[in-house]
Amino acid sequence: EEELQVIQPDKSVSVAAGESAILHCTVTSLIPVGPIQWFRGAGPARELIYNQKEGHFPRVTTVSESTKRENMDFSISISNITPADAGTYYCVKFRKGSPDTEFKSGAGTELSVRAKPSAPVVSGPAARATPQHTVSFTCESHGFSPRDITLKWFKNGNELSDFQTNVDPVGESVSYSIHSTAKVVLTREDVHSQVICEVAHVTLQGDPLRGTANLSETIRVPPTLEVTQQPVRAENQVNVTCQVRKFYPQRLQLTWLENGNVSRTETASTVTENKDGTYNWMSWLLVNVSAHRDDVKLTCQVEHDGQPAVSKSHDLKVSAHPKEQGSNTAAENTGSNERNIYGGSG
């Protein structure tokens, strides 16, 4: 009888993570008597995957009827494949003895595992930044195999080009990770903007995974201030308003100063929202001019989102007949809210 040969017909097998892998092996003879064993890897450090003779291998089942001697098919199925199962598997015939001795090995079957990348996680800077500044976003995805992967960045559907991507490790591994950093220039209109990281991989069948970051968590739009004097409401009373426009986020505190002395402090609450996501807010100050002998310098001071205060002043002439006066704008942006504040004397 011809000497036994161990035939592993498949040089390689590719399986998706979570599925079962079938590794084929047949022998050409019933002799010598002795067990078949499957190993992952070769040499002294090889890992026993299945032993026909003994042992408990919960993930391994024999594909064909193993209770018949004439069966020469020693194919196995390994369930619930993970990237850690990747490697070359050898079907080995042993000759019965003490100890059993290796008689002949198959040529090996390389098992590669297709593993999906994890959902991309996009993270932005730790601190908010203002328009015209460049900020960095990172995107990470892990656990995929094979190594080939494509990553793209978008801002509101427009592809970005200023980014750097690394796939680790560089050498062979059971699975890989991707890390990318993109640079984005902020504009005042970015409150509603999104940055998207898109990952395409063979396991995703043309349906890429996306991770997003809202620029609303990154941007700070400073308010612009405008202080104006309204027509006289009553004899000796002047209404001064401070318009706080186009600011974001909403966190804002306003203080009225009369000749440098704090008159009133309030926090923006009932704001109005602009289409671009920024906020507007208005504060009134009712000034009793008869209580003042000299001109009054009214200052609207705004502290936005923990930043240094910005202010806008208005000179109120007490000698002249009250009439509407204008004022310039200053600093930042974001918000909307109308609320009456009655301050001053009398």
Epitope: I31, V33, K53, R69, N71, G97
Partner: antibody, heavy 118, light 107 residues
């Protein structure tokens, strides 16, 4: 059903010959190593002979040169030709199938009695 | 030839008892050891192969262990039908050899 049925036992004089048969059913005999085991009255079990799937044969020392094991695939049968029989060959002879991959005995026949006496 | 020595040669026990029979090989036989049960006038029945694997249909009250030269057969809770003679056998190399047997009797 997997089954082994022995036949051919009987009374024979010392120096005589006997041919034991074992008919297999439920499996292909040629795919398995097959064995003969005997048990003298009131004694333990003794392995006698085996034939491998390639036709290779094995014997215990006391029967070597006197007994011949063979099989006939067409009849799915195993045989033991016993010549120059001695009184100490008196025993129940069992036909036994070797296991799937390690030749561990798994199926036994009911046995046939061989008595060597003058 | 490899010699197989069983002990004890006979053993008295009661229904419900747990009993252990030992078998020693004169040289290393890996785990190519089988256990058989035989009742008077009947053919032996295969219980265990490769020292610890149960043949199909054999109840789990039978268990085997060991490797190399020392082996044991344990019956966890004796029932009336378990009183019989038990044999060990090495089948690592020809000639295959049996132990002399252990007769398990009702006390």
């Amino acid at each position: 059903e997997v089954q082994l049925v022995e036949s051919g036992g009987g009374l024979v004089q010392p120096g005589g010959s006997l041919r034991l048969s074992c008919a297999a059913s439920g499996f292909t005999l040629s795919s398995y190593d097959m064995h003969w085991v005997r048990q003298a009255p009131g004694k333990g079990l003794e392995w006698v002979s085996a034939i491998g799937t390639a036709g290779d044969t094995y014997y215990t020392g006391s029967v070597k040169g006197r007994f011949t094991i063979s099989r006939e695939n067409a009849k799915n049968s195993l045989y033991l030709q016993m010549n120059s029989l001695r009184a100490e060959d008196t025993a129940v002879y069992y036909c036994v199938r070797g296991g799937v991959w390690d030749d561990a005995f798994d199926i036994w026949g009911q046995g046939t009695m061989v008595t060597v006496s003058s | 030839d490899i010699q197989m020595t069983q002990s004890p040669s006979s053993l008295s026990a009661s229904v419900g008892d747990r009993v252990t029979i030992t078998c020693r090989a004169s040289q290393d036989i890996n785990n190519y050891l089988a256990w058989f049960q035989q009742k008077p006038g009947k053919a032996p029945k295969s219980l265990i192969y490769t020292a610890s694997s149960l043949h199909s249909g054999v109840p789990s009250k039978f268990s085997g262990s060991g490797s190399g030269t020392d082996f044991t057969l344990t019956i966890s809770s004796l029932q009336p039908e378990d009183f019989a003679t038990y044999y060990c056998q090495q089948y690592v190399s020809y000639p295959y050899t049996f132990g002399q047997g252990t007769k398990l009797e009702i006390k």
